[in-house]
């Protein structure tokens, strides 16, 4: 027999017993010991491992008068709500002195109807899209086989005949209900009912009919909607930023677009009220009573320029001898593009009509020839963009010059012996 | 049967490192804590501590504080212990034993003999 | 901590008298927690009584302990040669544990 005997002998009157139930059972693990001197704290183990956070509670009775008498320690585990994870091999452990102490074991099993780790979930899907749905069940009792429902009717011949975990849709064209059923020994576990809700295709190939200035006209090809027909479609439109800030994949544009609705058919619109000469993104998306489809892409465009909506502004012609000093200023309308110049016209009253390109320069000297002898003569000035002429500014008489007003140094120019255009208006 | 087997003699010099192991069998390893026990030459017995061999949880006593330590290697049912910084009042012979519920040692380890010298 | 003062520390006997040898404690302990060892020359000492009146296995039975509070004591009712050793007893009332320093008991 081994030295020191007494290190062989459990304290453990009592062992925990065996647990089997259904999932969310309520059930409690007792042990017992009988202990000399002052009772010891008892650990609960599940497969070996001690519970940190166990609902125990653990009751000591003294048995004698002296604290050196034996105690009577009871300790009951509970489990509440019963979960796979709580399932295994159970027992108590006290430290008593130098040497621990386990229990025997007791077991705690599930068994009962099949459980969903994964259900069906509501979606949105295109019209004739695939798509796929999940289910997983698990007991025990394994196995569990699932059935799959399509709008309250089975898809297959029996449980675990058809789609397991996974189910393929190929395409739906109305909104449908999905649900599974898992069957095992114990009975038959319903999933929840997912609805998957069939939306209009995106549109495809959104594109420019025609350019205008201020606006655009831009068409599309409406996607399947299933038995659902489209009520409308909604263009949005935003500033490009010069190309910069929206990529084709980007959610959201960089400010507020503008939003225009479009009755349809046809699946056109005209946007309006843009700016000219503008880098623009447009996207479009199509909705029908179950709801919109996802938009397209940004589609970059442009508004081509305009001309000047407006003639140069604050003209001034002064007339010294045989020279002449015009100048003016921007015009205070919009150009609609980049300003590439300015034309100026002047005509005397017997003479006719002399046409220059001045340039960006926004003041001019002009030779005159006959040294002062063309009477009433008048200067027109209008600016000019790639997209052609403004409007004209009214005819300017050149005023003789005082001594006292500024007239700076400017290059001159001759004036051509023919007239280079002529206006119908004059 | 039971046995706790130590490592062999050591000669050390002092401000060395000494680790001795206390290799056991026959029992649950982590059922019974080990106690080390020194012994100076024509001395008594002196305890230095315990490890609880479930837990891994060393216990020292106040003269072993500081350059001793505890530790276990559970899979090979070993203990060990490390004495660091050694000086010549370590020279002794170290038991390692196990310990019961009633703080008794019942089984001893053969000893191991520390000679310390410069 | 619980210093225990053993006494004689060196006693001397002839084969077949009975001797008792003593272990005071500084403060009381259970009787469950004092222990004898036997230590042998060159030896590793061994359990030889627990919670002071039980024989280790293997221990003759002309070996006795008894004892509470803070006095304990050893006896042997009829010494042999082979009883030659040191006997150390041995405390826990809290850490650290602590052994007494030795009672040494010759056989003539």
């Known amino acids: 027999a081994p030295r020191g005997t007494q290190a062989e002998e459990s304290p453990f009157v009592g062992n925990p017993g065996n647990i089997t139930g259904a999932r969310g059972l309520t059930g409690t693990l007792r042990c017992q010991l009988q202990v000399q001197g002052e009772p010891p704290e008892v650990h609960w183990l599940r497969d070996g491992q001690i519970l940190e956070l166990a609902d125990s509670t653990q009751t000591q009775v003294p048995l004698g008068e002296d604290e050196q008498d034996d105690w009577i320690v009871v300790s009951q585990l509970r489990i509440t709500s019963l979960q796979l994870s709580d399932t295994g091999q159970y027992q108590c452990l006290v430290f008593l002195g130098h040497q621990t102490f386990v229990s025997q074991p007791g077991y705690v099993g599930l068994e009962g109807l099949p459980y969903f780790l994964e259900e069906p979930e509501d979606r949105t899907v295109a019209a004739n899209t695939p798509f796929n749905l999940s289910c997983q069940a698990q007991g025990p009792p394994e196995p569990v086989d699932l059935l799959w429902l399509q709008d309250a009717v089975p898809l297959a011949t029996a449980p675990g005949h058809g789609p397991q975990r996974s189910l393929h849709v190929p395409g739906l064209n109305k909104t449908s209900s999905f649900s599974c059923e898992a069957h095992n020994a114990k009975g038959v576990t319903t999933s929840r009912t997912a609805t998957i809700t069939v939306l209009p295709q995106q549109p495809r190939n959104l594109h420019l009919v025609s350019r205008q200035p201020t606006e655009l006209e831009v068409a599309w090809t409406p996607g399947l909607s299933g038995i659902y027909p489209l009520t409308h479609c909604t263009l949005q439109a935003v500033l490009s930023d010069d190309g910069m800030g929206i990529q084709a994949g980007e959610p959201d544009p960089p400010e507020e677009p503008l939003t225009s609705q479009a009755s349809v058919p046809p699946h056109q619109l005209r946007l309006g009220s843009l700016h000219p000469h503008t880098p623009y993104h447009i996207r479009v998306a199509c909705t029908s009573s179950q709801g919109p489809s996802s938009w397209t892409h940004w589609l970059p465009v442009e508004t081509p320029e305009g001309v000047p909506l407006g003639p140069p502004e604050n003209i001034s012609a002064t007339r010294n001898g045989s020279q002449a000093f015009v100048h003016w200023q921007e015009p205070r309308a919009p150009l609609q593009g980049t300003l590439l110049g300015y034309r100026l016209a002047y005509q005397g009253q017997d003479t006719p009509e002399v046409l220059m390109d001045i340039g960006l320069r926004q003041e001019v000297t002009l030779e005159l020839q006959g040294d002062g002898s063309v009477s009433n003569l008048t200067v027109c000035v209008a600016a000019y963009t790639a997209a052609g002429d403004g409007p004209w500014s009214l005819p300017v008489p050149l005023e003789a010059w005082r001594p006292g007003q500024a007239q700076p140094v400017h290059q001159l120019v001759k004036e051509p012996s023919t007239p280079a255009f002529s206006w119908p208006w004059w | 049967q039971i046995q706790l087997v130590q490592s062999g003699p050591e000669l050390k010099k002092p401000g060395e490192t000494v680790k001795i192991s206390c290799k056991t069998s026959?029992?649950?390893?982590?059922?019974?804590?080990i106690n080390w026990v020194k012994q100076a030459p024509g001395k008594g017995l002196e305890w230095m501590g315990w490890?609880?061999?479930?837990?891994?949880?060393?216990t020292y006593a106040d003269d072993f504080k500081g350059r001793f330590a505890f530790s276990l290697e559970t899979s090979a049912s070993t203990a060990y212990l490390q004495i660091n910084n050694l000086r010549d009042e370590d020279m002794a012979t170290y038991f390692c034993?196990?310990?019961?519920?009633?703080?008794?040692?019942?089984?001893w380890g053969q000893g191991t003999a520390l000679t310390v010298s410069s | 901590q619980n210093v225990l003062t053993q006494s004689p520390a060196i006693m001397s006997a002839s084969p077949g008298e009975e001797v008792t040898m003593t272990c005071r404690a500084s403060?009381?302990?259970?009787?469950?927690?004092l222990h004898w060892y036997q230590q042998k020359s060159g030896a590793s000492p061994k359990l030889w009584i627990y919670?002071?009146?039980k024989l280790a296995s293997g221990v003759p039975a002309r070996f006795s302990g008894s004892g509470s509070g803070t006095s304990y004591s050893l006896t042997i009712s009829s010494v042999e040669a082979e009883d030659a050793a040191t006997y150390y007893c041995?405390?826990?009332?809290?850490?650290?544990?602590?052994f007494g320093s030795g009672t040494k008991l010759e056989v003539k």
């Open positions: 034993t196990r310990g019961t519920m009633s703080y008794s040692f019942d089984y």
């Open positions: 403060s009381s302990v259970s009787s469950s927690y």
């Open positions: 490890i609880n061999t479930y837990l891994g949880e060393p």
């Open positions: 041995h405390q826990y009332s809290g850490d650290p544990l602590t």
């Open positions: 026959g029992y649950t390893f982590t059922y019974y804590g």
């Open positions: 919670s002071t009146s």
